[in-house]
């Protein structure tokens, strides 16, 4: 039975040209995390593997930095970065947990972070 929950940064906004940290946290489970995938819609951004470390997709190498922790930092944001991002936690023995973050990149200098929320 999967007992864990994913907490994410929820709906967030950031300024064009700026940077943002995408973070998810898996809680309420004793399962071991073996890998975390970060995806934008259907596009793989990065993989963090417990045995192999980080792999950043070549097309994002210059604009993505891993961390802090299992999070991901997006830099030099453009309006095209607006959209859904997913953290996919591969765990043993539970299986897969997925969290969703919606990022809006604003032209304006008024960009405020949304509240945290949980996905069971």
């Amino acid at each position: 039975m999967m007992t864990g929950t994913i907490e994410t940064t929820g709906n967030i906004s950031a300024e064009k040209g700026g940077s943002i940290i995408l973070q998810c946290h898996l809680s309420s489970t004793t399962a071991q995390v073996t890998q975390v995938n970060w995806e934008q819609q259907d596009q793989l951004l990065a993989i963090c593997n417990a045995d192999l470390g980080w792999h950043i997709s070549p097309s994002f190498k210059d604009r993505v930095a891993p961390g802090p922790g299992l999070g991901l930092t997006l830099q030099s944001l453009t309006v095209n970065d607006t959209g859904e991002y997913f953290c996919i936690y591969h765990t043993y023995p539970d299986g897969t947990y997925t969290g969703r973050i919606f990022l809006e990149v604003l032209e304006s200098s008024v960009a405020e972070h949304g509240a945290r929320f949980q996905i069971p």
Partner: antibody, heavy 117, light 107 residues
Framework: EVQLQQSGTVLARPGASVKMSCKAS????????MHWVKQRPGQGLEWIGA????????RYNQKFMGKAKLTAVTSASTAYMEISSLTNEDSSVYYC??????????WGQGTSVTVSS | DIVLTQSPATLSVTPGDSVSLSCRAS??????LHWYQQKSHESPRLLIK???QSISGIPSRFSGSGSGTDFTLSINSVETEDFGLYFC?????????FGGGTKLEIN
């Protein structure tokens, strides 16, 4: 086998600079952050900063901005830390450690720096 | 910066005792907390990752618990090789920070 081999003991004068190295082997150097941690004799651990050789991203503890400079040469799988304007407060053991998102799982043996006139 | 406060600073125990070491964060760090052991004249060693996840090669007598701001490292039936310094460290946000440490010594 993963190994982090650090350069040897350094004795330096106040005001001088030192550059120490951390040679990585046994894993993909560009897939892990390399952290640098300071430990004064008989004291705790203090995080200086980290470099991600995959794209040379760096993160610093504000306290060490301008004091420590982190670099990496991927072709040699080696990370470097340069400490400038040395004072007695910089006399410490400095550790490098790797982190791939799951804690700092391997550490170097430490480089001892003594600042003395 | 996130401040990690460890207590007690020193813990005197007898081999065979079970002990708990505390680490408290100045703000919520969810489960982004790791524990390290450092023996005299040695480099630190990772004991527990993400508050409670075990590390290959670390004896099962070491376990971790907690989330948010309060975390505990437990050692079930301390052995003589366990004496030394213990540090917690957060990876929730930059800059990473360490706690001040707990010294586990022989009573």
């Amino acid at each position: 086998e993963v190994q982090l081999q650090q350069s040897g003991t350094v004795l330096a004068r106040p005001g001088a600079s030192v550059k120490m190295s951390c040679k990585a082997s046994g894993y993909s150097f560009t897939s892990y952050w390399m952290h640098w941690v300071k430990q004064r004799p008989g004291q705790g651990l203090e995080w200086i900063g980290a470099i991600y050789p995959g794209n040379n991203a760096t993160r610093y503890n504000q306290k060490f901005m301008g004091k420590a400079k982190l670099t990496a040469v991927t072709s040699a799988s080696t990370a470097y830390m340069e400490i400038s304007s040395l004072t007695n407060e910089d006399s410490s053991v400095y550790y490098c450690s790797r982190e791939g998102g799951f804690g700092m799982d391997y550490w170097g043996q430490g480089t001892s720096v003594t600042v003395s006139s | 910066d996130i401040v990690l406060t460890q207590s007690p600073a020193t813990l005197s125990v007898t081999p065979g005792d079970s002990v708990s070491l505390s680490c408290r964060a100045s703000q919520s760090i969810t489960n982004n907390l790791h524990w390290y052991q450092q023996k005299s004249h040695e480099s630190p060693r990772l004991l527990i990752k993400y508050a409670s996840q075990s590390i290959s090669g670390i004896p099962s007598r070491f376990s971790g618990s907690g989330s948010g701001t309060d975390f505990t490292l437990s050692i079930n039936s301390v052995e003589t090789e366990d004496f030394g310094l213990y540090f917690c460290q957060q990876s929730n946000s930059w800059p990473y920070t360490f706690g001040g440490g707990t010294k586990l010594e022989i009573n």
